[in-house]
């Protein structure tokens, strides 16, 4: 018998679509073979119809595809606009159709129920609202006006215009008789349940004048949607639920194995631990639609989920629902880079964030996750150059290493820096990945004077201090702007092997900045690095001041002043909303540190070392 | 929670037929799917037979021993889901249980199925 299996019948009616799932072995070889659904003929023959390698026959054209889902050893193939003309017999199958393992489905396409004449159908899904209509003639406006549900022979009264309202729909049910003039009144119909499917009468007047009208209600339980997504990247689940309950509390929530529904996050305030620095409920828009977005994908995310609209926040019966099916793909395009990274207060980290390298061009952006409500991110930097105030002097987002990866460094690391923060472009938005920023005890490995005052037309000198684990890195120091930093020309002094040796002596590398002007003020940076792949920085504000007295500035770490104030975050924050993904430029306005003017260049500034050996660290 | 009760088993001849109804009731959420499992003494239990659906689609999936003798159908205005048994055997001599799901992985699988009915008899003598 063959290990392929599936629906053997499927029965649907005319204008239908339907999803016929086929199952496989999931071997290496099952999974990358071809996937085809054939439709068999009186000769015995099956003939392709759609495939796994993009055919499409014509009679499927549009309306037709078929997609693999390696991970489960599954595929599926979902056919719309169903005709009678698609009765019959198929295979599902892998391989060649003649001598594939495959599994015999039968199609059965009705014309589906026959109705009275002049029935109007209402499709509508379970917990949503439907709106019946109604007309009569004048004679009868001013008649009992009513709605009745046929049960086989009989007709049950629903709701009439003299207050009469059915048990069964109590408090989810309203007759509306306009003003005269309009022939026509309206039954609505909230919270629509499975049982409320069905065939019902509208009636105005009695006797043989009295208007009828049939309306069949199907009342539809929400199909899954299938999302696929990748390892360690990011779904959103787009939730559009109805104006009806635009104003009511919403909900993400996931199925367990009990078939009941965990609350992933509500609109009331709950979120899974789980879920912790990883999701974001965006704002509703005035339609009552919302989405939430969850990144940095595990395995364990795999499962149902529902979003829904009730006051508790969570699962109710008979309230509108969607619903989806996540897959997580194991073979992920998206790299691995590490989830949590370790620095010490007063030192730096540097965070390697993918994105999708087909999309280079991209803007960059990296955001702090904050779980207060429905959590939000505001933009701290972007690839443009634009820095949150307070962030000034410390914290840069550069394009290296490029091809997939860009880098974020954040220095001068205090304990409220630790939390979760997420990167993303304004490109693929499967790419946006987390990472949580922990501070540890320690004390940082580079070492640098706090506040320097220059003084004008003089020289500075300025020391940075490493261990010897960095010895053979290279490294730099740089000018930091809200565009990035500058990496000054550094000059190499004294022989090599005072390095190699590690003389404690030499463990220094010095900005010179001769002379100084007033465009040296501002942040420098110095740091290590490997390639292009960033370690450990350290960040020195240089102040310059007019000329009192004559000679060279020297300065030692032990004449470090304080750092300066840190300035308060503004109000006004760029925050990932569901348009701002898409479109950057949709953020809300906030203030930017103003450039800081030219870089220090050119010969006047140059920094000793007396290594020119190539390598790099990390923070991580 | 969903309960599932079954009933319709019974005592019958090799050849016979008989037909097992579960009815399913408290609904938290809607059931995409509803099938039977069946368990024969002393070994495990296994699947017979399920049908998932969306609106007026309906997806009937068999076990290969079943080879056109058992039918599941389903009454949506009762919710209740029915086995035809045709051409008995005895060994399809088992207890035969409801069970329930949002069904989306492979309906085959025991643990795809959340909710259970306590199992109803089928004899089939020779």
């Known amino acids: 018998k063959s290990p392929v299996f599936g629906p053997q019948e499927v029965s649907s009616v005319e204008g239908n679509s339907v999803s016929i799932k086929c199952y496989y072995p999931p071997t290496s070889v099952n999974r990358h073979t071809r996937k085809y659904w054939c439709r068999k003929g009186a000769s015995g023959r099956c003939i392709t119809l759609v495939s796994s390698e993009g055919y499409v026959s014509s009679n499927y054209a549009g309306r037709a595809n078929l997609t693999n889902f390696p991970e489960n050893g599954t595929f599926v193939v979902n056919i719309a606009q169903l005709s009678r003309d698609d009765s019959g017999h198929y295979k599902c199958g892998l391989g060649i159709n003649s001598r594939g393992l495959s599994f015999d489905v039968s199609l059965e396409v009705s014309q589906g129920p026959e109705l009275p004449n002049g029935t109007e159908v209402y499709t509508v899904d379970v917990g949503r609202t439907v709106t019946i209509k109604c007309p009569f003639k004048t004679e009868n406006a001013p008649k009992t006006k009513a709605l009745y549900k046929k049960i086989g022979q009989t007709s049950v009264l629903v709701i009439d215009s003299r207050n009469y309202v059915n048990p069964n729909y109590k408090d989810r049910i309203r007759l509306r008789i306009p003003g005269t003039g309009q022939l026509i009144f309206t039954v609505v119909i909230d919270r629509l349940r499975l049982s409320d499917h069905g065939l019902y009468l509208c009636q105005a007047g009695d006797g043989s004048n009295r208007d009828e009208k049939n309306a069949d209600l199907q009342v539809l339980e929400p199909e899954p949607e299938l999302v696929y997504e990748d390892l360690r990247g990011s779904v959103t689940f787009h939730c559009a639920l109805g104006l009806e309950v635009a104003n009511v509390a919403k909900f993400l929530c996931r199925v367990n194995s009990r078939e009941t529904c965990d609350v992933v996050i509500n609109t009331l305030g709950k979120r899974d631990s789980a879920f912790e620095g990883r999701i974001l409920l965006n704002p509703q828009d005035k339609d009552g639609s919302f989405s939430v977005v969850i990144t940095g994908l595990r395995k364990e995310d795999e499962g149902r989920y529902l979003c829904g609209a009730h006051s508790d926040g969570q699962l109710q019966e008979g309230w509108p629902i969607q619903a989806w099916q996540l897959f997580v793909n194991e073979e992920s395009t998206i790299p691995r880079s590490p989830t949590v990274v370790k620095g010490v207060a007063g030192g730096s980290v540097a965070v390697l964030c993918p994105y999708n390298p087909k999309e280079s061009q991209s803007l960059k952006y990296w955001c702090l996750w904050e779980g207060a409500q429905n959590g939000r991110c505001p933009l701290l930097v972007e690839s443009q150059g634009l820095v949150q105030e307070q962030y000034e002097g410390r914290l840069s987002l550069l394009q290296e290493p490029g091809n997939g990866t860009f880098t974020v460094i954040l220095n001068q690391l205090t304990t409220q820096d630790a939390g979760f923060y997420w990167c993303l472009t304004n490109g693929d938005t499967r790419w946006r990945t987390t990472v949580e920023i922990k501070i540890i005890e320690g004390e940082p490995n580079l070492k640098v004077p706090g506040n320097v005052t220059a003084v004008l037309g003089e020289t500075l000198n300025i020391p940075c201090h490493f261990p010897c684990k960095f010895s053979s890195y290279e490294k730099y120091w740089c000018k930091w702007s809200n565009t990035g930093c500058q990496t000054l020309p550094s000059q190499d002094e004294g022989p090599s092997e005072a390095f190699v040796n590690c003389d404690e002596n030499s463990r220094l590398v010095s900005l010179t900045l001769n002379p100084v002007t007033r465009a040296d003020e501002g942040w420098y940076w110095c740091g290590v690095k490997q390639g292009h792949f960033y370690g450990e920085t350290a960040a020195v504000y240089v102040a310059v001041e007019e000329k009192k007295v004559a000679g060279s500035r020297y300065v030692s770490p032990a004449k470090a002043d304080a750092a300066p104030d840190e300035k308060v975050l503004d109000s006004g924050v760029r925050e990932i909303e569901n348009k701002a993904i898409q479109d950057p430029r949709l953020f809300a306005e906030e203030k930017v540190v103003a450039d800081t003017g030219d870089q220090a260049g050119g010969s006047r500034a140059s920094v000793d070392s007396s290594s020119s050996e190539e390598q790099g660290g990390s923070s991580k | 929670q969903v309960q599932l009760v079954e009933s319709g088993g019974g005592l019958v001849q090799a050849g016979d037929s008989l037909r097992l109804s579960c009815a399913a009731s408290g609904r938290t959420f809607p059931t995409y799917a509803m099938g039977w499992f069946r368990q024969a003494p002393g070994k495990e239990r296994e699947f017979v037979a399920t049908?998932?659906?969306?609106?007026?689609?309906?997806?009937?999936y068999y076990a290969d021993f079943v080879k056109g003798r058992f039918t599941i159908s389903r009454d949506n205005a009762k919710n209740t889901v029915y086995l035809q048994m045709d051409s008995l055997k005895p060994e399809d001599t088992a207890v035969y249980y409801c069970a329930a799901t949002t069904l989306l992985g492979d309906p085959r699988a025991l643990n795809e199925y959340a909710y259970w009915g306590q199992g109803t008899q089928v004899t089939v003598s020779s």
């Open positions: 049908i998932r659906w969306s609106g007026s689609t309906q997806y009937k």
